[in-house]
């Protein structure tokens, strides 16, 4: 498959495979390799409740527990991203694992992740149009963290 | 700049810019766009000590505080990654912000992130060798999380 650097995608170089109607098989193979969330997705009840478990994956044992929500985009590499959703407003007590402690806040940790979008190349028309790979930063919540509330000066 | 998909890089399609001795300017622009860590890098003392601050970035206010360590690879996109390094073995008390609570462990949250490496294409020799863009999963520690210790069955 022939490619070329395309400067037209937000001034970022990118790769433009030639195609007919649909992007080539290469794109499918490249983009669809699945990326799991940092912790295995748990479908058990406790992963969705405001409590800190004594077993299971990290996100359910944390005193700032969270669940993962899928963000799937067929035009993006990676195709699947996961967003952490905090299950409690405050941290769970280390003693009980269930009661919340108002001294601590459970807050999401955000990160701008590098992703790549498939875009039609500028100035390409007709059925044999090429695609650009456009680099972008995409905000995801990675985890929930138990923090001491910020003291305002 | 002419490119092509190269199947030889770990059986993943990739983009091979032609080059003379050095990677093209496009690669440099593409790969070096800096990606910050999730929280601003703090060079103040408390970000490097085992205590939970009442101000500053999330990683220093967490009761499982961590610092960021730079992982720079000029042949990778993104060029800069950051690894979280836990500053305490146990979680810090929400009351004091300094004393450790043995009821909680401070543990790193790992994630396999999609990255791309620049590789010489298979079967390319001489001064006009091309480069492949090879997709890989790369393990990074995203943050440190306060968890209840796992109970062994």
């Amino acid at each position: 498959v022939s490619l070329r650097i395309q400067e037209g995608c937000s001034h970022l170089p990118s790769c433009c495979p030639s195609k007919e109607q649909e992007p080539p098989e290469e794109w499918l193979k490249w983009s669809s390799a699945s990326v799991s969330p940092p912790e295995p997705l748990s479908h058990t009840h406790h992963a969705e409740s405001c409590r800190a478990s004594k077993d299971g994956p990290l996100n359910s044992r944390a005193i700032s527990p969270w669940s993962y929500e899928l963000d799937r985009d067929l035009n993006r590499v990676p195709q699947d991203l996961y967003h952490a959703r905090c299950l409690c407003p405050h941290c769970v007590s280390l003693q009980t694992g269930s009661h919340m402690d108002p001294l601590g806040n459970s807050v999401p940790l955000y990160h701008n992740q590098t992703v790549f979008y498939r875009r039609p190349c500028h100035g390409e028309e007709g059925t044999h149009r090429r695609y650009c790979l456009e680099r972008r930063l995409y905000r995801v919540s990675l985890a929930c963290v138990c923090v001491r509330p910020r003291v305002m000066a | 700049v002419s490119l092509r998909i190269q199947e030889g890089c770990s059986h993943l399609p990739s983009c091979c810019p032609s080059k003379e001795q050095e990677p093209p300017e496009e690669w440099l622009k593409w790969s070096s766009a800096s990606v910050s860590p999730p929280e601003p890098l703090s060079h103040t003392h408390h970000a490097e000590s085992c205590r939970a601050s009442k101000d500053g970035p999330l990683n220093s206010r967490a009761i499982s505080p961590w610092s960021y360590e730079l992982d720079r690879d000029l042949n990778r996109v993104p060029q800069d990654l950051y690894h979280a390094r836990c500053l305490c073995p146990h979680c810090v008390s929400l009351q004091t912000g300094s004393h450790m609570d043995p009821l909680g462990n401070s543990v790193p949250l790992y994630h396999n992130q999609t990255v791309f490496y620049r590789r010489p294409c298979h079967g390319e020799e001489g001064t006009h060798r091309r480069y492949c863009l090879e997709r890989r999963l790369y393990r990074v520690s995203l943050a440190c999380v306060c968890v209840r210790p796992r109970v062994m069955a």
Partner: antibody, heavy 120, light 108 residues
Framework: QVTLKESGPGILQPSQTLSLTCSFS??????????VGWIRQPSGKGLEWLAH???????QYNPALQSRLTISKDTSSSQVFLKIASVDIADIATYYC????????????WGQGALVTVSS | QIVLTQSPAIMSAFPGEKVTMSCSAS?????MYWHQQKPGSSPRLLIY???NLASGVPVRFSGSGSGTSYSLTISRMEAEDAATYYC???????????FGGGTKLEIK
């Protein structure tokens, strides 16, 4: 050749559960990137996305209707199912199933539609 | 939730005339899709990923736009193009597919 065909009860009473089946051919729902979705259209009105199911059994729902919807699939028999609980007259519409993917989020193939009426 | 507003709601054109219809998003979207629906028939995908022609669609159809403003153009209107046209977008998180209210195109 890709084809999709919807089937359902045609008519049902308020508060009953609507069960719809989409039978498809010409593609496999085990292929990476492939999905099948449900869209409905009240007579003379616009289109409303309800739900879809992906090749890896990930299910996604319209938040406004999520509590009433259940989507599932049988890959081996090339069928996708949609259940809508507690129907009322607002659910009277033509229900379409459509393929999504494998490389974009348009709906390149649609079924002919199944008209559903709610009447007491 | 993103809302898509199509304009005009109804329009008419002579055969051979150039036709342009708009789709405005309440906030920025990555891609736009366009579907054609004739009375008594299922919708048909015309344009995907903003500007790509779906399989079997005549080249007189084209799509363009970015951000919150998108359009569908028919370079030369034909009688068979009389239909209702829907724009469609999706957001990956939270997942939501949204359709515009439609533009009804009639032949003069």
């Amino acid at each position: 050749q890709v084809t999709l065909k919807e089937s359902g009860p045609g008519i049902l009473q308020p508060s009953q559960t609507l069960s719809l089946t989409c039978s498809f051919s010409g593609f496999s729902l085990s292929t990476s990137g492939m999905g099948v979705g449900w869209i409905r259209q009240p007579s003379g009105k616009g289109l409303e996305w309800l739900a879809h199911i992906w090749w890896d059994d990930v299910k996604q729902y319209n938040p406004a209707l999520q509590s009433r919807l259940t989507i599932s699939k049988d890959t081996s028999s090339s069928q996708v199912f949609l259940k809508i609980a507690s129907v009322d007259i607002a659910d009277i519409a033509t229900y379409y199933c459509a393929r999504i993917g494998p490389v974009h989020h348009g709906f390149p193939y649609w079924g002919q539609g199944a008209l559903v009426t709610v009447s007491s | 939730q993103i809302v898509l507003t199509q304009s005009p709601a109804i329009m008419s054109a002579f055969p051979g005339e150039k036709v342009t219809m708009s789709c405005s998003a309440s906030s920025s979207v990555n891609y736009m899709y366009w579907h054609q629906q004739k009375p008594g028939s299922s919708p048909r995908l015309l344009i995907y990923d903003t500007s790509n022609l779906a399989s079997g669609v005549p080249v007189r159809f084209s799509g363009s736009g970015s951000g919150t403003s998108y359009s569908l153009t028919i370079s030369r209107m034909e009688a068979e193009d009389a239909a209702t046209y829907y724009c469609q977008q999706w957001t990956s998180y939270p997942p939501m597919y949204t359709f515009g209210g439609g533009t009804k195109l009639e032949i003069k």
